[in-house]
């Protein structure tokens, strides 16, 4: 919608455009309008852009009017929230940005017969982008002057310069997104796609064999399994086999058969041949043993000379018998081949909870700390291990010991420092526990063993110049006598700081006051009043730039006053016929030296740098990744050695690339398993792991491999008015305005009439980076002097 708000109206005489009075006749004496005031209301007509405005024709973008909002003169700038002075024109089309606006002030006749009369009309053709900011416009010619402000705002959920980009956030089955400030959909975490209705699967989920319908999920296709659906399912019943594709059963070495369950190397797997027999594989799950002499049987398990193979272990002696052999075991061993160690811990002979360890033909007791001896029957002397830390002595007891602690210590081993801090410290002091004692650490301003004493900071008489010292906690205060100040009354008060004297007057400090020595033209306590020389001395016009005035301050008795028409950047030069010209300082041009020469004309900034014009100088604001006076140097982004684990760094524009070694991955070769981390993509970009590389999806306003380069789009088309320079600032922009303009998009004309440059009650007319003085009767010159 297009909004217009009337701010003020000045119709000093209460006149209409045709010169008549709003109500009633003129006063014959001063020709001013008498009787009642104008009943002012406004009409607005908004239409397509016209370079030459025509008053007629339809208001194709809309029209409206206010009720009567005031009389001849009124100011509504302070009355916020008053809708009477506001006209709202809704539009259902794309806002074209350029427009023509006709604003008319009317006098209501309050009469059905008498028609309303026009007071003043203003027309304005321009371009305005949707914004919450108001743009102020003025009608300063004709019988009435009025001021109004306009703006265009987009309806909710509409964006862009034309208010024709629609985006409404949603978070349901059909989409999961918010809208950025340009009306682009920004997907919520876990969602992607133009409508943000495609789930982002678990990182690492196989794009070929896995999929998901909810974020973070990874659902496997038929025949695939695993957390990432990257493992095939082998044929059911496959024993010693693997698969490359689902339902395969590819046998491991030495296995065969449909299910890889047939052992092709029975000899290697089972080693069935005993007594030095040689094994041969004869087929799947089949083998044959060839036995050494004296052995037989399928596994060479039958000994033909039983004692030949030394069957009796652990130094047992062998005797051949009719059934084979018999072993006579050495002490501590038993069993048919003497291979079983007799358990000497049965029954357990260890006392006092000792643990019995069986040895060959014997046992050993592992005793608890308080006992010793072969069967833990003896009391151990614990004092031998010196367990007492801070003690006078150690006493051995049956199955225990006792430490006689030194003062301040406690615990079985006298290793616990008794806490002697029991709240003795006062005034919020902290207590430090010592051995058999404590120490109070006092807060500033307190002293004493328990911080019970307030330190008298006045004891050293710190106050100077007769100041009275007042003791406070951890500080003192000096009450200073008149004429002195400072925390120690060390300063004689300087009434000249800050300088109260105006117009270049010299300030002199006194004991309790100051005195301003005024220059000749000024008077008053602070030299703020201009002396009216014309009460006493007549002025004589010397030329178009100078007037002479009688003065006691110069030897000749005459003082020359120069015109300031050429402003701060030029000197006035008198020409014949009452004319003048301005000699401009370096860097300025124009009739009044009011234009700053554009030093950026030659486009000196390289590599996309933005040139900011200065006075007889310029400055380059470089694009990301460039530096130097002309943005000619590519910043070395490898200077900080960002690549880890032996990676090689290659410098790019505002970026770097790491060539990783030995299976390292990621932007900085920092990871074994992922190309992405939270720092890979800059400026809110989303990182996608693409196996041997990463990819950044950049938000609006950013581009480049890691979203490190600001797009110029926020400066296209140039949003800065009146020759302002646009500087890209991420997704937004900043305007650097030319002299004479201000505001976020350089749309506001700087008030060149501030501070008052026109003398002798002259009226100042503000222009675009210039002003003009309209002099009061009896005065002349560019500044009415």
């Amino acid at each position: 919608q297009f909004e217009l708000e009337i701010l003020s109206m000045q119709n000093v005489n209460g006149e209409l455009q045709n010169g008549n009075c709003c109500g009633g006749a003129r006063n014959p004496g001063d020709r001013k309008c008498t009787r009642d005031e104008c009943d002012t209301y406004f009409k607005v007509c908004l239409k397509e852009y016209q370079s030459r405005v025509t008053a007629g024709g339809p208001c194709s973008f809309g029209s409206g009017s206010t009720p009567v909002i005031g009389g001849n003169t009124f100011n509504l700038k302070a009355s916020r929230g008053n809708d009477r002075n506001r006209i709202v024109l809704p539009f259902s089309f794309a806002w074209p940005r350029s427009y023509t606006l006709l604003v008319e002030a009317w006098d209501s006749s309050n009469d059905t017969v008498q028609p309303d009369s026009i007071i003043e009309k203003a027309s304005h053709s321009g371009m305005i982008n949707p914004s919450r900011q108001w743009q102020t416009l003025k009608q300063n010619t004709g019988v009435a002057h009025f001021e109004y402000q306009i703006r265009v705002t987009c309806d909710d959920y509409y964006y862009g310069f034309g208010c024709n980009k629609f985006c409404r956030p949603r978070d349901d089955f059909f989409g999961h997104y918010a809208c950025d400030q340009n009306g682009n959909k920004t997907c919520m975490e876990g969602w992607m796609g133009p409508e943000c209705n495609r789930a982002i699967c678990r990182q690492g989920c196989s794009p070929k064999h896995g999929s998901c319908k909810l974020p973070g999920d990874c659902r496997c296709q038929y025949g695939w399994q695993g957390l990432y659906c990257d493992k095939c399912i082998p044929h059911p019943g496959c024993v010693h086999g693997i698969c490359n594709e689902p339902w395969q059963c590819l046998c491991e070495t030495n296995w065969g058969g449909q299910l890889c369950d047939k052992d092709l190397n029975y000899c290697g797997t089972h080693q069935p041949c005993l007594n030095g027999g040689t094994c041969s594989n004869t087929g799947p799950d089949k083998y044959q043993c060839s036995c050494p002499e004296g052995y037989s049987g399928p596994n060479c398990e039958i000994a033909e000379h039983a004692c030949l193979s030394d069957p009796c272990h652990n130094r047992g002696s062998c005797k051949e018998t009719s059934l084979g052999f018999e072993c006579e075991c050495s002490p501590g061993w038993t069993g048919p081949t003497c291979s079983t160690n007799i358990d000497d811990c049965s029954p357990n002979n260890c006392s006092h909870g000792g643990t019995c360890q069986d040895l060959v033909n014997g046992f050993k007791c592992v005793c608890p700390p308080q006992w010793t001896g072969k069967t833990c029957q003896l009391d151990a002397n614990e004092c031998e291990a010196k367990p007492c830390v801070n003690a006078k002595s150690c006493k051995n007891l049956i199955a225990s010991y006792y430490c006689d602690c030194l003062p301040g210590w406690m615990g079985q081993n006298c290793d616990i420092n008794i806490n002697d801090c029991l709240g003795q410290c006062q005034n919020d002091a902290s207590c430090r526990d010592l051995v058999n004692g404590y120490r109070c650490i006092c807060p500033p301003g307190y002293a004493g063993d328990h911080c019970e004493r307030d330190i008298d900071e006045c004891a050293s008489n710190p106050c100077l110049n007769g100041g009275h010292c007042q003791n406070e906690i951890n500080r003192f205060q000096c009450l200073c006598p008149t004429g002195f100040s400072g925390n120690l009354c060390q300063l004689d008060i300087d009434y000249c700081e800050p300088n109260p004297c105006q117009n270049g007057a010299q300030c002199y400090n006194r004991a309790s006051d100051y005195f301003c020595k005024c220059p000749e033209d000024y008077e008053g306590k602070n030299c703020s009043h201009l002396k009216d020389h014309c009460r006493t001395t007549p002025c004589e016009v010397i030329d178009s730039c100078t007037v002479a005035m009688a003065s006691n301050d110069t030897p000749e008795g005459v003082r020359y006053i120069s015109s300031n028409v050429c402003g701060p950047h030029g000197k006035c030069k008198s020409q014949s016929g009452g004319k003048f010209t301005c000699d401009c300082n370096k860097g300025f041009t124009g009739t009044y030296c009011h234009e700053n020469i554009n030093d950026c004309e030659s486009n000196p900034c390289r590599n996309g740098g933005t040139c900011i014009d200065g006075v007889n100088s310029y400055k380059c604001i470089c694009s990301d990744g460039w530096e130097g006076a002309y943005c000619e140097t590519n910043i070395n982004d490898c200077s900080q050695n960002p690549c880890h684990n032996g990676g090689t760094c290659r410098d790019l524009v505002n970026d770097f690339y790491c060539d990783c070694k030995n299976g390292w991955k990621g932007k900085t070769c920092h990871s074994r398993d992922s190309q992405c981390d939270e720092a890979t993509c800059n400026n809110g970009g989303t990182c996608y792991d693409e196996g041997d590389a990463f990819k950044c999806m950049c938000p609006g306003g950013w581009e480049g491999t890691t979203c490190n380069i600001a797009r110029n789009s926020s400066c296209l088309p140039n949003p800065c008015h009146n020759g302002g320079t646009c500087v890209v600032n991420g997704e937004s922009f900043t305007c650097v305005c030319k002299e004479g303009w201000e505001g976020p998009i350089c749309a506001q004309n700087t008030n060149d009439c501030s501070p008052h440059p026109c003398y002798n009650s002259g009226t100042c007319v503000d222009g675009d980076n210039w002003y003009r003085c309209e002099c009061a009767p009896g005065f002349a010159g560019p500044d009415c002097r």
Epitope: E195, A199, L214
Partner: antibody
Framework: QVQLVQSGAEVQKPGASVKVSCKVS????????IHWVRQAPGKGLEWMGG????????VYAQKFQDRVSMTQDTSTDTAYLQLSSLTSGDTALYYC????????????WGQGTLVTVSS | QAGLTQPPSASGTPGQRVTISCSGS????????VNWYQRLPGTAPKLVVY???QRPSGVPDRFSGSKSGTSASLVISGLQSEDEADYYC???????????FGGGTQLTVL
């Protein structure tokens, strides 16, 4: 105010097709997302499909995918449901409904069309 | 399709408070909002609660909804005779890629 008016009752033989219409008034069809829901006698409500406002295409319930077609005639602001290969199990009340403009619920329903499949 | 599970029937006397439950899974109620429809005999369904707990204008404030995890509830406090109807819960399902309705609960006012 949106109004949905459906066509009258139909009797069809098994194996035949049926086409039910839903006329929109108060809004244009292109401003709405029309969906179809049915209810067999003694059974609950069953969603058949409808227009996805974000992807701009019609989505069907997996159960009906092979034999349902939903079309729209924007010149007459009428939506159609066509169901083929009818069986007695398709005897039901068929409703058209509008999906709320910024939500996932149905805020307006037609009065329903009874389709009877009988030999 | 498993759908959403509702008790087949519920009842209460005028003025009483009645709760109808609806249980689903992570792919429907767990990740989407729940809507409730009332079907009076011989009429088209009518929305009584949307987005888990919002009431359309014109629906009395004795109807309220809630959701927790993969379950949802419709509460009718101060039961009235005109509330006698079938009530259906509904939620969109990511696995089914469509809308699921509960089997419906027949509410009787005794």
């Amino acid at each position: 105010q949106v109004q949905l008016v459906q066509s009258g009752a139909e009797v069809q033989k098994p194996g035949a097709s049926v086409k039910v219409s839903c006329k929109v008034s108060g809004y244009t069809l292109s401003e709405l997302s029309i969906h179809w829901v049915r209810q067999a006698p003694g059974k609950g409500l069953e969603w058949m499909g409808g227009f996805d406002p974000e992807d701009g295409k019609i989505v069907y319930a997996q159960k009906f995918q092979d034999r349902v077609s939903m079309t729209q005639d924007t010149s007459t602001d009428t939506a159609y449901l066509q169901l083929s290969s009818l069986t007695s199990g398709d005897t039901a009340l068929y409703y058209c409904a509008t999906l709320a403009q910024w939500g996932d619920w149905f805020d307006r329903w037609g009065q329903g069309t009874l389709v009877t499949v009988s030999s | 399709q498993a759908g959403l599970t509702q008790p087949p029937s519920a009842s209460g006397t005028p003025g009483q408070r009645v709760t109808i439950s609806c249980s689903g899974s992570s792919s429907n109620i767990g990740s989407n909002t729940v809507n409730w429809y009332q079907r009076l005999p011989g009429t088209a369904p009518k929305l009584v609660v949307y987005s888990n707990n919002q009431r359309p204008s014109g629906v009395p404030d004795r109807f309220s909804g809630s959701k927790s995890g993969t379950s949802a509830s419709l509460v009718i406090s101060g039961l009235q005779s005109e509330d006698e109807a079938d009530y259906y819960c509904a939620a969109w399902d990511y696995d089914e890629e469509g809308l699921l309705f509960g089997g419906g609960t027949q509410l009787t006012v005794l």
